[in-house]
């Protein structure tokens, strides 16, 4: 069976306190624990939770926790559920509230004579004691015309008379603590000679140019003395004016009218209302010339058929605030419907194309009237004026594939190739009209060609094949000038395409025949021993049926391929000294011979007096210097081949001769002596 | 342990009340002792209705029949009661009473055709 | 309200064979998950309460494990008596719900 341990038990509670409800239970298995308050299931929050079995508040509450908490134990296995005795929280508190007019009904039926009572609103648990204040001063019970009723929480005045004007507040104080009135009492019990607002000046404003009246009234026995003042305290009667304002008439029941106003006449206005006894009463209006700023403007707007949008108009600062409507063809829009107007927003339902247009926002207010236009474009979505076609494109021309549509706003259209974005560049262009121009049509071009056209409605598109009308060509075109060398095997290759398999011939230029050593194999000449007949001028023949005959010359040299006679050695020179470097060629053509040194050719022009360069291709460097050390490269060549051959070249300090060492001592590595 | 009452066949439209009689044993006091009412149709496995605290007449019902199952009990009796009402065909299974999850009465079988 | 999905639907098993059967909550319920067991023409029995713990009766060849959202209960060398229904049942929330259960029969 269940058994409570601990048991809940009723107790005392300070209102925003912490409190705790314990609850222990033993059970033969796992029991599930929780709390009723007042029948129904408690649940955890920030302010009241489960702690283990027990119920903690971590600030309590005399609204909401008050009531009948029991705890609650169940065995779910069992099925068994045992309560706990019934505990509830006597809680302490007390709560501040504002000093409040009983009798009479209102402030206005305020009479001096009168009994006045007042009530504070400060409430607690237990009761608390009161007590009150005037201007801060404490009123003890018994005093002269007023009695404390503190069941009733109650201030009563009688018969009240101005000596009881002031400012009357209460305190409380309980158990739990004290407590002062959150909102105060002014009494104000007139005496008849001081004066009264009757009717008070209100802030205006006006448009330039325009009249502008200011009411004031007092009331006193005997009857008061009013004045106006202008901002700068200059007062203003019928008699003395300020210069700026001439414009001004004081009436006998205190009304000041001011016509023709202008911005200087803006401003704070005192109407001061004075008695025969008591302080002067001044009430204070502004006068405010009427202003309306710009609008800003609106970006034109695209919306959808069937969409619901809305396009807000800003009104522009202005005094008044202006107000706003919006038109339509010169018809102010309605509040409710299709197309209307909520608030500063146009509101377009279900829009329809017939809605495109322009819509007009009217701000106005006295200083005059503003207007801006937004212009709404309804979207559809894109019509074929002209699809894509399969197209056939010849090769080397420029292509056209249409893609013409038409939409609002004007359509973008874009082309995909191979399902990849078409970006424009050197060979496509994307005209205005949607058209794609292929600008020189390549064989790889031929494959799927799709285009779409888009509005903020919608898109369409299409696709279409290109199928690449090649051109007969040679692939790659023959070089118009060839080698072969002397005594050797050698091959001269021609291959061309078109729209058919072109046939390829090979003829001598002058029309004669090939001799027996030279094959046409497929295209390729081929020459089984090169001899010097064999130079000469060749044409490459290449045809098919629709395409017809393609030529391409090629001029063909005999050569003896270049081979060095004399090749530079690696040299070391003292410095000072003067560097020869040997290099002689020999083939047919003659070869021409070049020197690079240090990564750049030497200019035979321009070596200086140090460098010259021999007839038969060798180099000398008189004088030489470190710098002049590095690779030197000669190369030889001529028409129909290139062959180069380097050597370093070392340039050293000379070395002074040790006593040991005679004259005819030879030097420690191999030397140009000059 | 838990005793219920017999097979039942019924028309579409008709109440049933099915009883489960709880037997007293050392130590058990029936008013304490929530009962709970299970459901088992074939290839539906078991479907929990709710339960009831006779002592108190607490009641916690699974959404899905309430307005179609209302639980009342008799402490002098010892006795818990499920009335079934508006029945259907869907309505025709085996109702287990049970005391916790130990203890199951044996079934009552309620048939609904017409 | 908490899902409960039993897996396998059937499990054919051979006498003295080891066997797991698996629950699966759609949220977790911490340790409140029981089995029961069901032979035809006859009432569920409680085999373990919260998740692991044994009831008095039931042979120790029945163990319960996981917690959270995945359970099992492992039948250590299966008996021609243990062969029937197993269903798993949550007490985490209202309303109880139960799995749709597992038929452990004879391969």
């Known amino acids: 069976a269940i058994v409570f341990i601990k048991q809940p038990s009723s107790q005392d509670a300070l209102q925003g306190r912490r409190a705790l409800l314990r609850c222990e239970v033993e059970a033969p298995g796992p029991v599930h624990v929780y709390w009723l308050l007042d029948g129904a299931p408690v649940q955890d929050t920030e302010r009241r939770f489960a702690q283990g079995s027990s119920l903690s508040f971590a600030a309590v509450d005399r609204l909401q926790d008050s009531g009948t908490f029991q705890c609650v134990a169940r065995d779910d296995v069992t099925g068994e559920e045992a309560r706990s005795a019934n505990a509830s929280f006597n809680i302490k508190w007390i709560e501040a509230g504002p000093v409040v007019l009983k009798h009479p009904a209102s402030e206005a039926e305020i009479q001096p004579q009168t009994q006045v009572t007042l009530r504070c609103h400060i409430d607690g648990h237990p009761r608390p004691t009161y007590q009150w204040f005037r201007d801060g001063t404490p009123l003890s019970d018994g005093q002269s015309n007023h009695t404390v009723s503190s069941k009733e929480r109650n201030l009563t005045l009688r018969p009240a008379g101005p000596e009881h004007s002031g400012l009357y507040s209460c305190c409380a104080h309980s158990a739990f603590g004290q407590a002062c009135s959150s909102q105060n009492f002014t009494l104000s019990i007139a005496d008849e000679s001081f004066a009264r607002v009757v009717l008070a000046p209100q802030d205006v404003v006006v448009a330039r140019y325009e009249e502008a009246m200011f009411h004031c009234q007092f009331s006193a026995q005997p009857p008061p003395s009013l004045q106006w003042l202008f901002e700068d305290e200059t007062p203003i009667t019928n008699r003395s004016r300020p210069p700026h304002l001439r414009r001004a008439t004081v009436f006998a029941n205190g009304s000041l009218l001011l016509t023709q106003v202008r911005p200087r006449n803006a401003g704070i206005y005192r109407c001061i209302g004075q008695g025969q006894r008591g302080p002067p009463i001044i009430l204070e209006a502004t006068l405010h010339l009427a202003e309306i700023e710009d609008m800003p403007l609106f970006e034109p707007r695209v919306f959808t058929a069937g969409s619901e949008e809305r396009v807000t108009c800003l009104p522009p600062k202005g005094l008044p605030e202006p107000s706003v409507w919006w038109e339509h063809a010169g018809v102010r829009l309605p509040t409710h419907g299709r197309v209307y107007q909520k608030g500063h927003e146009l509101v377009l339902a279900n829009i329809a194309e017939s809605d495109a247009g322009v819509y007009t926002c009217h701000a106005a207010n006295l200083a005059g009237q503003r207007r801006q236009d937004v212009n709404i474009t309804v979207a559809t979505v894109p019509s074929w004026l002209k699809k894509p076609q399969d197209s056939q494109l010849e090769e080397g021309k420029p292509g056209y594939l249409d893609c013409l549509t038409q939409a609002t706003p004007k359509p973008t259209v874009v082309w995909y190739r191979n399902q990849m974005l078409i970006s424009e560049d050197s060979r496509f262009e994307v005209f205005k009209n949607g058209t794609l121009r292929i600008n020189s049509v390549e064989v790889y071009d031929g494959t799927w060609y799709r285009c779409m056209s888009s509005t903020p409605a919608g898109s369409i598109e299409a696709q279409a094949r290109v199928q690449v009308l090649e051109k007969l060509k040679f692939t790659p075109p023959p070089q118009p000038q060839q080698c072969m060398e002397f005594d050797k095997e050698a091959t001269v290759p021609c291959s061309a395409t078109g729209r058919e398999k072109p046939t390829i011939k090979w003829e001598r230029a002058d029309g004669s025949s090939l001799p027996e050593w030279v094959t046409d194999n497929a295209g390729t000449l081929h020459f089984a021993r090169v001899t010097r007949d064999d130079a000469g001028n060749y044409t490459c023949i290449a045809s098919n049926g629709p395409q017809g005959q393609i030529r391409a010359h090629v001029q063909l040299t005999v050569a003896v391929f270049i081979t060095f006679k004399v090749e530079p050695e690696r040299t070391t020179v003292y410095q000072g000294h003067t560097a020869l470097l040997q290099c002689e060629a020999q083939g047919d053509p003659k070869p021409l011979i070049q020197w690079k040194g240090k990564d750049r050719i030497l200019d035979p022009t321009k070596l200086g007096p140090r460098m010259h360069i021999f007839q038969n291709g060798s180099l000398v460097i008189h004088d030489v210097a470190p710098e002049d050390s590095g690779r030197y490269t000669c190369i030889a060549g001529n028409s129909c081949n290139i062959k180069h051959t380097e050597a370093p070249l070392y340039v050293v300090d000379k070395p002074v001769p040790e006593e040991s060492e005679g004259p005819g001592s030879p030097p420690p590595y191999k030397m140009i002596q000059t | 342990q838990l005793e219920e009452s017999g097979a039942e066949l019924m028309q579409p439209g008709a109440s049933v009340k099915v009883s489960c009689k709880a037997t007293l044993e050392e130590g058990y006091t029936f008013t304490v002792y929530w009962i709970e009412w299970v459901k088992q149709r074939p290839g539906h496995g078991l479907e929990w209705i709710g339960e009831?605290?006779?002592?108190?007449?607490?009641?916690d019902y699974n959404e899905k029949f309430k307005g179609k199952a209302t639980f009342t009990a008799d402490s002098s009796s010892n006795t818990a009661y499920m009335q079934l009402s508006s029945l259907t065909t869907e309505d025709s299974a085996i109702y287990y009473c049970?005391?916790?999850?130990?203890?199951w009465g044996q079934g009552t079988l309620v048939t609904v055709s017409a | 309200d908490i899902v409960l999905t039993q897996s396998p639907a059937t499990l054919s098993v051979t006498p003295g064979d080891s066997v797991s059967l698996s629950c699966r909550a759609s949220?977790?319920?911490?340790?409140?998950l029981h089995w029961y067991q069901q032979k035809s023409h006859a009432s569920p029995r409680l085999l373990i309460k919260y998740a692991s713990q044994s009831i008095s009766g039931i042979p120790s060849r029945f163990s319960g494990s996981g917690s959270g959202t995945d359970f099992t209960l492992s039948i250590n060398s299966v008996e021609t008596e243990d062969f029937g229904m197993y269903f798993c049942?949550?007490?985490?929330?209202?309303?109880?719900?139960f799995g749709g259960g597992t038929k452990l029969e004879i391969k």
């Open positions: 949220q977790s319920v911490s340790n409140n």
């Open positions: 049942q949550q007490s985490y929330s209202w309303p109880r719900t």
């Open positions: 049970a005391r916790g999850k130990l203890h």
């Open positions: 009831i605290l006779p002592g108190s007449g607490s009641t």
